[in-house]
Amino acid sequence: APPRLICDSRVLERYLLEAKEAENVTMGCSESCSLNENITVPDTKVNFYAWKRMEVGQQAVEVWQGLALLSEAVLRGQAVLANSSQPFEPLQLHMDKAISGLRSITTLLRALGAQEAISLPDAASAAPLRTITADTFCKLFRVYSNFLRGKLKLYTGEACRRGDR
C-alpha cells in the first residue's frame, strides 16, 4: 500500500460510512441479530483532553491493541453467523465488508509506519486495554464505527500531520 494512503480523508471516510451503514441496517433487527454470546471488544471512549497530550507512540499502542481485538471480535461474529440456522440476510454482506475493512486499515497503518511508532517503553508502560462486551451484531458494528471515528481517526490525523512536517 502507498505509505500515506490512509492520510487521504476519503479512504477512512469510506470505511466510516460502511460501518455506519452496517450499524443502521442491524439497528432494526432484534432476534436474528443477537450474537447469543458476549464478545469482548475494545472500549471506544476517548477522553480527548488526555488523548491529545498522549505521546504518539502511546496512541499507536492503543490503536493497535484495539484493532487486534476488534478484528478478533468481528471474525468471531462471522463464525456465529456461519453457524446460524436463519441468518438475517444483509448481515453477511456487512460482516464481509467489516472484515475486509479491518484488514485494509491494518495494512494501511503498517504502510504509514504506525507499528514503528511504538517504542519499547510505550508498549511496556501502556495501560491494559479497556474492554466492554457486545451481545448483538448492532453493538459490534457500533463499536467498529466508534473505533474508526474515535481513536483511529484521531491517531491517523496526528500521525499524518507529523509526517507532513
Partner: antibody, heavy 123, light 109 residues
Framework: QVQLVQSGAEVKKPGSSVKVSCKAS????????ISWVRQAPGQGLEWMGG????????DYAQKFQGRVTITADESTSTAYMELSSLRSEDTAVYYC????????????????WGRGTLVTVSS | SYVLTQPPSVSVAPGKTARITCSGD??????VHWYQQKPGQAPVLVIY???ERPSGIPERFSGSNSGNTATLTISRVEAGDEADYYC???????????FGGGTKLTVLG
Amino acid sequence: QVQLVQSGAEVKKPGSSVKVSCKASGGTFRSYAISWVRQAPGQGLEWMGGIDPISGFADYAQKFQGRVTITADESTSTAYMELSSLRSEDTAVYYCARELYYPGTWMAVMAYWGRGTLVTVSS
Amino acid sequence: SYVLTQPPSVSVAPGKTARITCSGDNIPEYYVHWYQQKPGQAPVLVIYRDNERPSGIPERFSGSNSGNTATLTISRVEAGDEADYYCQVFDESSWHWVFGGGTKLTVLG
C-alpha cells in the same frame, strides 16, 4: 442527580478579567470533563474550551487562546473559567456543561448544564 | 475550522412534523448532537450520536444523518416545543466542539 451551580452575574470594565465558577454535585467530579460555552445576547452557542479534572488538561478554542484559562479544583468539585482583556463583545451568558458518555458514544456529549452566568462588559 | 449551517427559522402548525436541518461537509462522517434551548434557559440535549434520545426526551424527537445533511425531526409538534435548536459535532481536525448557528422553531397559532 447531577447539578451544576454557577456563580452570580458580574459587571466588568473593558480590559479587566472575570472568573466564573461552576460547582458540581452528584456523580464523581473527576470522572467527567467540563466544557465552557458562551452565548452573546441574541446569538448562538460558542464553545470556549474544556478541562479533564483527572489530568488537569485543558483545551481551548482558537478564538480564545491566550485569553481564557480553565481550571478545576477537585477538593471542592468546582471548575473555573477566567477570561482576561475583556471587551464589550464579551458580554454574554457563560455556561458550564458537564460531559457524559452515553452508551455507544466514543466522545462525551454535554449532558448537564449550569444555569449560566451573565457577564456584562461596560465602561 | 468545520462549519455547520442551520436555517435561521422554521415554522410549523401544532400536530404537524417539524424538520430542522444542519449541513456541513461530509457530515455523515461525524456524529451529530442536538440541543433545545428555551428563552432564558440553559440548553438541553435532545438527540445524541445522530439519532439517539437521552432518557426523558419524548419519542417525538428523532434524528438522522445522511447525504450532506443531519436532520432533527419533531413529530406531532406541541406549543412547548417552541425553542431554539442547535446541532453540534466534535471536529477531530481542530479538536474542538462546533455548534451550528441555531434554528428558531415557531409553533403557529
